[in-house]
């Protein structure tokens, strides 16, 4: 699987999950999130050659097409597969609220 | 929706479904498919700016991050959303077989 366990411990050039830390204040301008100050969001990057973690029959066909037509602009793309939530603390007036922001952290990628 | 109805009738630069015809023999080297000779597979292409058909909370955050950090390599990618099957005819010995190949035709795209 193209997950953090494999991708973070390898020098994989093909589609894999990469490390990305987002600072809520600096990167998004979000001052309203009290905790955490930022989080390891990660992102997906890398080419999707034939057979490399392809998502559907279509992505297999497209990767094969791309292999035979290397100049083509049609190719599968490396995108999130497994996403996890992020618990945050923010304030409504003076009252702290804890909420899970769904689908915020990339754990693995796929070629789609 | 970034579907064939909208995308094929517009000059949309952002993520949209684009026309692509795949000839099974010429483009894939597949001689075994008797009918059809090829099909309109289509593909997804175009940038994914903030708010543009974003798939998850993560893709919104990533698009926002990318908007504030334009040099970053982390950005959502335009990939298939709705896929349709393709009926094909192939031979097993001298006996024709009809089969639906699932997820073969792109009908719409999203930013993931």
């Amino acid at each position: 699987a193209l997950d953090t366990n494999y991708c973070f411990s390898s020098t994989e050039k093909n589609c894999c999950v990469r490390q990305l830390y987002i600072d809520f204040r600096k990167d998004l301008g979000w001052k309203w999130i009290h905790e955490p100050k930022g989080y390891h969001a990660n992102f997906c990057l890398g080419p999707c050659p034939y057979i490399w973690s392809l998502d559907t029959q279509y992505s297999k066909v497209l990767a094969l097409y791309n292999q035979h037509n290397p100049g083509a602009s049609a190719a599968p793309c490396c995108v999130p597969q497994a996403l996890e939530p992020l618990p945050i603390v923010y304030y409504v007036g003076r009252k702290p609220k804890v909420e899970q922001l769904s689908n915020m952290i990339v754990r693995s990628c796929k070629c789609s | 929706a970034l579907d064939t109805n909208y995308c094929f009738s517009s000059t949309e630069k952002n993520c949209c479904v684009r026309q692509l015809y795949i000839d099974f023999r010429k483009d894939l080297g597949w001689k075994w498919i008797h009918e059809p000779k090829g099909y309109h597979a289509n593909f997804c292409l175009g940038p994914c700016p903030y708010i543009w058909s974003l798939d998850t909370q993560y893709s919104k955050v990533l698009a926002l991050y990318n908007q504030h950090n334009p040099g970053a390599s982390a950005a959502p990618c335009c990939v298939p959303q709705a896929l349709e099957p393709l009926p094909i005819v192939y031979y097993v010995g001298r006996k024709p077989k009809v089969e639906q190949l699932s997820n073969m035709i792109v009908r719409s795209c999203k930013c993931s």
Partner: nanobody, 118 residues
Framework: EVQVVESGGGLVQPGGSLRLSCAAS????????MGWFRQAPGKQRELVAI??????TYADSVKGRFTISRDNAKNTVYLQMDTLKPEDTAVYFC?????????????WGQGTQVTVSS
């Protein structure tokens, strides 16, 4: 339900100025990402400017001419448009992206027409 209401559009001569306002529901405004978008006839809606907390970003076509600002006390985001050009003619829409709470989601205003013509 989050309300988003734009105002301030109108007819202006090339080189002139306009200020658009967008009021959003007080309950979510402080953590909403507020964006201005525009749609010219026969074209797709495009991003003009975003105010994300204390960070702003602009489309290349309006950089140096348009300024987005927000007033948290009034739950309003403004778009100051200077040195207007005929190609700025469009319907301008305000968008509120609410990332948290029961009202989380995307909300759009009805739009306000801006026409730049002599």
């Amino acid at each position: 339900e989050v309300q988003v209401v734009e105002s301030g559009g109108g007819l202006v001569q090339p080189g002139g100025s306009l200020r658009l306002s967008c009021a959003a529901s007080a309950s979510v405004f402080s953590w909403s990402v507020m964006g201005w978008f525009r749609q010219a006839p026969g074209k797709q809606r495009e991003l003009v400017a975003i105010s994300s907390g204390d960070r702003e970003t602009y489309a290349d076509s309006v950089k140096g001419r348009f300024t987005i600002s927000r007033d948290n006390a009034k739950n309003t985001v403004y778009l100051q448009m200077d040195t207007l050009k005929p190609e700025d003619t469009a319907v301008y829409f305000c968008n509120a992206y609410v990332p948290v709470g029961e009202s989380r989601g995307d909300y759009w205003g009805q739009g306000t027409q801006v026409t730049v013509s002599s």
